[in-house]
Interface confidence: medium
């Protein structure tokens, strides 16, 4: 789902950030960053290239921008020595994926944006909430959204919908 | 490249179940939907259901329900559907997808006396 | 269950000419309409979802149409590696159903 759909970070609201309890991985998504890990690590060395990075993140859902990747590369192979470890590729990780929505999250996010209690977000809704967030979206990008997540075809995004593109990738 | 490599063919006994899997490569297994379609000599295309890897999320047809038992291993990658009380209406060719892009080769079950 | 329905079993043509291959849906299935080819003793392969969105690596001369209920797969400039039999699927709701299938053959 494109921004529209997304809650404003602290950063555009111009909060401050409190400080966190570190963050955590569930087993389950220690694991799958594994996965990605491993299908960039081919000869099992236990090491990816910093170039590579990108490209694993990417595998895992994330679109880093290149100031976020030169960041990043520099924080964790800061001997320059091309490669990133696994607990490291990890740490990365860990921190990006604990920003992501928790299923009630995704489900109070849900709410705000069916403030008419249909139990559908229609384009009005949509609309209503990217002007509110000041998301400079055209009507043919807010459309293309709800199409994206829209599986039954009938112009709005339910809840299950709306959880599904929120939660996991899909070709359609 | 995504790649789906199905185990081998399988001649079973009526009554019996058969478990055949799916190792998939190339991609994060955990993040796509693994799809599982069944296929009768000469015949059409059957949609059995589906899992999500990532939590074991499932849907079925109902026509499957009962029959079929999706089920993922994310540390060896690999899809398993297990098939029971076979009888011969279940001889056919199954297929894995990823999500129908991406599709295994084919197992084979006969079910025979 | 939505029913996907492909009135022709089989449908004739020659190399160079264009072919369509129709897919009716037993109710409103909006565009969540995916089509597929099939070939003698292979897997299944995706050309075209979203009712009109050609997969990667499939050639242009494969078109998709339709929405609602009824859907067409175009071949234009038929070669003759496109003998196969043809699929349409629905995916607007669970459980996803194909159509019975038309084989193409080559005159």
């Known amino acids: 789902m494109a921004s529209g759909f997304k809650k404003p970070s602290a950063a555009s609201t111009g909060q401050k950030r409190k400080v966190a309890p570190k963050p955590e991985l569930t087993e389950d998504q220690k694991q799958e960053v594994r996965e990605a890990f491993d299908l960039f690590d081919v000869d099992g060395s236990g090491t990816i290239d910093a170039k590579e990075l990108k490209v694993a993140m990417r595998a895992l859902g994330f679109e880093p921008r290149k100031e976020e990747m030169k960041k990043m590369i520099s924080e964790v192979d800061r001997e320059g020595t091309g490669k990133i470890s696994f607990n490291d590729f990890l740490a990365v990780m860990t921190q990006k994926m604990s920003e992501k929505d928790t299923k009630e999250e995704i489900l109070k996010a849900f709410r705000l944006f069916d403030d008419d209690e249909t139990g559908k977000i229609s384009f009005k809704n949509l609309k209503r909430v990217a002007n509110e967030l000041g998301e400079n979206l055209t009507d043919e990008e807010l459309q293309e959204m709800i199409d994206e997540a829209d599986r039954d075809g009938d112009g709005e995004v339910n809840e299950e919908e709306f959880l599904r593109i929120m939660k996991k990738t899909s070709l359609y | 490249q995504v790649q789906l490599q199905q185990s081998g063919a399988e001649l079973v006994r009526p009554g019996s179940s058969v478990k055949i899997s799916c190792k998939a490569s190339g991609y994060v297994f955990s993040r796509y939907w693994m799809n599982w379609v069944k296929q009768r000599p000469g015949q059409g295309l059957e949609w059995i259901g589906q899992?999500?890897?990532?939590?074991?999320?499932?849907d079925y047809n109902g026509e499957f329900k009962g029959k079929a038992t999706l089920t993922a291993d994310r540390s060896s990658s690999t899809a398993y559907m297990q098939l029971s009380s076979l009888t011969s209406e279940d001889s056919a060719v199954y297929f894995c997808?990823?999500?129908?892009?991406?599709w295994g080769q084919g197992t084979l079950v006969t079910v025979s006396a | 269950d939505i029913v996907m329905t492909q009135s022709h079993k089989f449908m004739s043509t020659s190399v160079g000419d264009r072919v369509s291959i129709t897919c009716k849906a037993s109710q409103d299935v909006g565009t969540a309409v995916a089509w597929y080819q099939q070939k003698p003793g292979q897997s299944p392969k995706l050309l075209i979802y979203?009712?009109?969105t050609r997969h990667t690596g499939v050639p242009d001369r494969f078109t998709g149409s339709g929405s609602g209920t009824d859907f067409t797969l175009t071949i234009s400039n038929v070669q003759s590696e496109d003998l196969a039999d043809y699929f349409c699927q629905q995916y607007s709701s669970y459980p996803y159903t194909f159509g019975g299938g038309t084989k193409l053959e080559i005159k």
């Open positions: 899992i999500y890897p990532g939590d074991g999320d499932t």
């Open positions: 997808a990823r999500e129908f892009a991406y």
């Open positions: 979203w009712a009109s």
